[in-house]
């Protein structure tokens, strides 16, 4: 039995997968912030997690996925104000009783030290210093991401 949030996450991911393939992104668009091989957009308004997920999708991006502790720290370094919380693309899957990224993978327990409960209708936010479990209905800011395409040297066959 999937929760409405899980369904929403799956639907959006599937619709993203169906969209026409676009050319790779070589540079971050204006208004987006480059962090290594990603472009990030920090929202200015607040929304529950579901709406944040949908907003990123309309921007042809996804809620932020964090690979490891190092990426978390680099992202947190961009946040100037200690009091501001941002949704990322991680929520509690009731069916699997585990934290699940919106790309379908599960959280490696060593990656993030989450403050708060792992329970139904819990979604993950980050601040300048911490990672929190919040009710998904809480209205806070969010971070969208786009992956930059690595530039590979083209190899031409001998003429």
């Amino acid at each position: 039995q999937k929760s409405s949030i899980e369904k929403c996450s799956v639907d959006i991911q599937q619709s993203r997968n169906k969209t026409t393939e676009r050319p790779g992104l070589l540079n971050c668009p204006i208004y987006w912030q480059q962090l290594r091989e990603k472009c990030l957009l920090f929202s200015h308004t607040v929304n529950p997690w579901n709406n944040s997920l949908a907003d990123c999708s309309t921007k042809e991006s996804s809620l932020l996925l964090i690979r490891d502790k190092d990426e978390l720290i680099h992202t947190q370094n961009l946040i100037r104000d200690k009091a501001i919380l941002f949704w990322i693309g991680l929520n509690f899957s009731l069916s699997e009783k585990n934290w699940k990224w919106i790309n379908g993978s599960f959280l490696n327990s060593n990656d993030l030290e989450i403050r708060g409960d792992a329970k139904e209708n819990s979604c993950i936010s980050i601040s300048q210093t911490s990672v929190y479990s919040e009710y998904c209905s809480t209205e806070i800011r969010w971070i969208c991401q786009k992956e930059l395409t690595p530039v590979r040297n083209k190899v031409y066959p001998d003429s």
């Epitope: 920090f42 309309t58 042809e60």
Partner: antibody, heavy 116, light 111 residues
Framework: QVQLQESGPGLVKPSETLSLTCTVS????????WSWIRQPPGKGLEWIGY???????NYNPSLKSRVTISMDTSKNQFSLKLSSVTAADTAVYYC??????????WGQGTLVTVSS | DIVMTQTPLSSPVTLGQPASISCRSS???????????LTWLQQRPGQPPRLLIY???NRFSGVPDRFSGSGAGTDFTLKISRVEVEDVGVYYC????????FGQGTKLEIK
């Protein structure tokens, strides 16, 4: 209602640095982008650059080597520095709030004259 | 740079009559996030610019409904259904698909 007010010297000598501050009231600079735009007398508008509320900046490539925009969240202010000025930098300088291309609130503007 | 070209540069209009300003960009203004960041600004004499329309056709709060925006890709239009005295000034289109650039301005005056 968000209000912006530019302040700084109205006269700058050639080769010196122009420094302006924009004070924001009626809202926090902990959201949105905050831009500087200028308008030479009798001419059109030119975007100088913005600072993002997380602190990162983006500048007009033609001015990039001379421009620095910074912010002071404790004072709800952001500032412009333009180095090595010439007479061509004489303009009315505006600060504005930028919602991804929608410059929705503007200061009244301040005329900066570059002259010895 | 994206070059924004406005026509006409001057537009004498009779009070109560419609007015139309065209803006053409040197390349598509569709941002990589799917939105089109095309804005219209009004600058009355001696005043700072004022936001009228954003993202092609969205009227900013407090802007009278006689102002409307349309277009797509590289061609955009600002229409005033019935010109009033307070509409006199210079109108600028602006793009923010890349670093922002403005059109050269269209001066609206009363005949």
């Amino acid at each position: 209602q968000v209000q912006l007010q530019e302040s700084g010297p109205g006269l700058v000598k050639p080769s010196e640095t122009l420094s302006l501050t924009c004070t924001v009231s009626g809202g926090s600079i902990n959201s949105y982008y905050w831009s500087w735009i200028r308008q030479p007398p009798g001419k059109g508008l030119e975007w100088i650059g913005y600072i993002y509320y997380i602190g990162s900046t983006n500048y007009n490539p033609s001015l990039k080597s001379r421009v620095t925009i910074s912010m002071d969240t404790s004072k709800n202010q952001f500032s412009l520095k333009l180095s090595s000025v010439t007479a061509a930098d004489t303009a009315v300088y505006y600060c504005a709030r930028d919602r991804m291309g929608a410059l929705d609130y503007w200061g009244q503007g301040t005329l900066v004259t570059v002259s010895s | 740079d994206i070059v924004m070209t406005q026509t006409p540069l001057s537009s004498p209009v009779t009070l109560g009559q419609p007015a139309s300003i065209s803006c053409r960009s040197s390349q598509s203004l569709v941002h990589s996030d799917g939105n089109t960041y095309l804005t219209w600004l009004q600058q009355r004499p001696g005043q700072p610019p004022r936001l009228l329309i954003y993202e092609i056709s969205n009227r900013f709060s407090g802007v009278p409904d006689r102002f409307s925006g349309s277009g797509a890709g590289t061609d955009f239009t600002l229409k005033i259904s019935r010109v009033e005295v307070e509409d006199v000034g210079v109108y600028y289109c602006m793009q923010a698909a890349q670093f922002p650039t403005f059109g050269q301005g269209t001066k609206l005056e009363i005949k």
